[in-house]
């Protein structure tokens, strides 16, 4: 199976929190209504945004102590015997490559960093998405080639590495050698693509790639 | 306040070469995508190259392509574009500029300009 | 490439006048369309960027609209320091093309 039943439920941010009345909120309000996810997101972000710091703080202080709890159950955890596999990365795997808006948010994180110096992880985030939205397709080119670039070396990079197959992780516990190549493989796309998300995670990027031209 | 200090025109002989230079001041250069744009005497504008702020992305016009190179320097605070295989259509002014909002390409501030005249 | 076409090329009027200069694109540009004025032996100053967004700084009696392939640059009461050459460029799509220009004259 996927998770475990029994593992901690993840922290929730400030943020998260807020959404999370609002959702509530809007229950009560309209029970019998469907909603709209990407409107109520954006009502959301927009409400969130004109909110006073003092207005935040509850939520703040309701993440604090999720944060809090979650790492109190944390150190009580024990995870299943399987699970300590996923936690092995050979680092001699060839990285991930990163993504056309990736590459663009590294060009242009410092300048919204060092305009709005208060800025959030995720409101950094948000505001390089929106740049990348309001970038016209010649502008993206140049990223999205060397995306590309980079896709195709990793592509050959990957297939060598497999072909010459994975170092003997099974000494570490970790991949138990009767299990078929084919779920081997996808097992090791499942990991590129958690690289990727670990990667992006630390450098401040939770936006989503929406790459809309007109 | 922002300046964009352009050198390193003049004249210049056909199929000979010419490095431009533009100093940036007043502003994070390394923030900014750059670029050039060029002004033929009397006539209008015409989109040369930019540079991303990193330099690691370059874009020209197909008139320069191959014959032209942008570069930065962004510990010097300074834009380059190297110029070869000079044609007497390449002669105008030459306008370093910097692109305000992102890669998109509005030039919010331009320096004086420095003319490049390719004559024999 | 991505033709941009200014008229008129040149416009004679006078202090306190309302003037309209048009800018079209051969293709659809969406609204990725600056405004640049330009003095003699001077470099561009920007105006106006992405079809209506007046620079900080440029007086408000400049505005600019339109969408798709056809564009306007007003200016609603003529000043003196207004006389200059005007442009339009798209950013929308390489090589990023300015029109030929408009030459504001008084009258």
């Known amino acids: 199976g996927k998770g475990d039943p029994k593992k901690p439920r993840g922290k929730m941010s400030s943020y998260a929190f807020f959404v999370q009345t609002c959702r509530e909120e809007h229950k009560k309000k309209h029970p019998d209504a469907s909603v709209n996810f990407s409107e109520f997101s954006k009502k959301c972000s927009e409400r969130w945004k004109t909110m006073s710091a003092k207005e935040k703080g509850k939520f703040e202080d309701m993440a604090k102590a999720d944060k809090a709890r979650y790492e109190r159950e944390m150190k009580t955890y024990i995870p299943p015997k399987g699970e300590t596999k996923k936690k092995f990365k050979d680092p001699n795997a060839p990285k991930r490559p990163p993504s056309a808006f990736f590459l663009f948010c590294s060009e242009y994180r410092p300048k919204i960093k060092g305009e709005h110096p208060g800025l959030s992880i995720g409101d950094v985030a948000k505001k390089l998405g929106e740049m990348w939205n309001n970038t016209a397709a010649d502008d993206k080119q140049p990223y999205e080639k060397k995306a590309a670039k980079l896709k195709e070396k990793y592509e050959k990079d990957i297939a060598a590495y497999r072909a010459k197959g994975k170092p003997d992780a099974a000494k570490k516990g970790v991949v138990k050698a009767e299990k078929s190549k084919k779920k081997k493989e996808e097992e090791e796309d499942e990991e590129d693509e958690e690289d990727e998300e670990e990667e992006e995670d630390e450098e401040d990027e939770e936006e989503e790639e929406d790459d809309d031209d007109e | 306040e922002v300046q964009l200090l352009e050198s390193g025109g003049g004249l210049v002989q056909p199929g000979g070469s010419l490095r431009l230079s533009c100093a940036a001041s007043?502003?994070?250069?390394?923030?900014?995508?750059t670029g050039w744009v060029r002004q033929a005497p009397g006539k209008g504008l015409e989109w040369v190259s930019g540079i991303s702020p990193s330099g690691g992305y370059t874009q020209y016009a197909d008139s320069v392509k191959g014959r032209f190179t942008i570069s930065r320097d962004n510990s010097k605070n300074t834009l380059y574009l190297q110029m070869n295989s000079l044609r007497a259509e390449d002669t105008a002014v030459y306008y370093c500029?910097?692109?305000?909002?992102?890669?998109?390409?509005?030039?919010?501030?331009w320096g004086q300009g420095t003319l490049v005249t390719v004559s024999s | 490439d991505i033709q941009m076409t200014q008229s008129p090329s040149s416009l004679s009027a006078s202090v306190g006048d309302r003037v309209t200069i048009i800018c079209r694109a051969n293709e659809r540009i969406n609204t990725y369309l600056n405004w640049y004025q330009q003095k003699p032996g001077k470099a561009p100053k920007l105006l106006i960027s992405g079809t209506s967004s007046l620079e900080s700084g440029v007086p408000s009696r400049f505005s600019g609209s339109g969408s798709g392939t056809e564009f306007t640059l007003s200016i609603s009461s003529l000043q003196p320091e207004d006389f200059a050459s005007y442009y339009c460029q798209q950013s929308y799509s390489s090589p990023y093309t300015f029109g030929q220009g408009t030459n504001l004259e008084i009258r």
């Open positions: 007043g502003f994070t250069f390394s923030w900014y995508e």
């Open positions: 500029a910097r692109s305000g909002v992102g890669a998109t390409k509005i030039f919010d501030y």
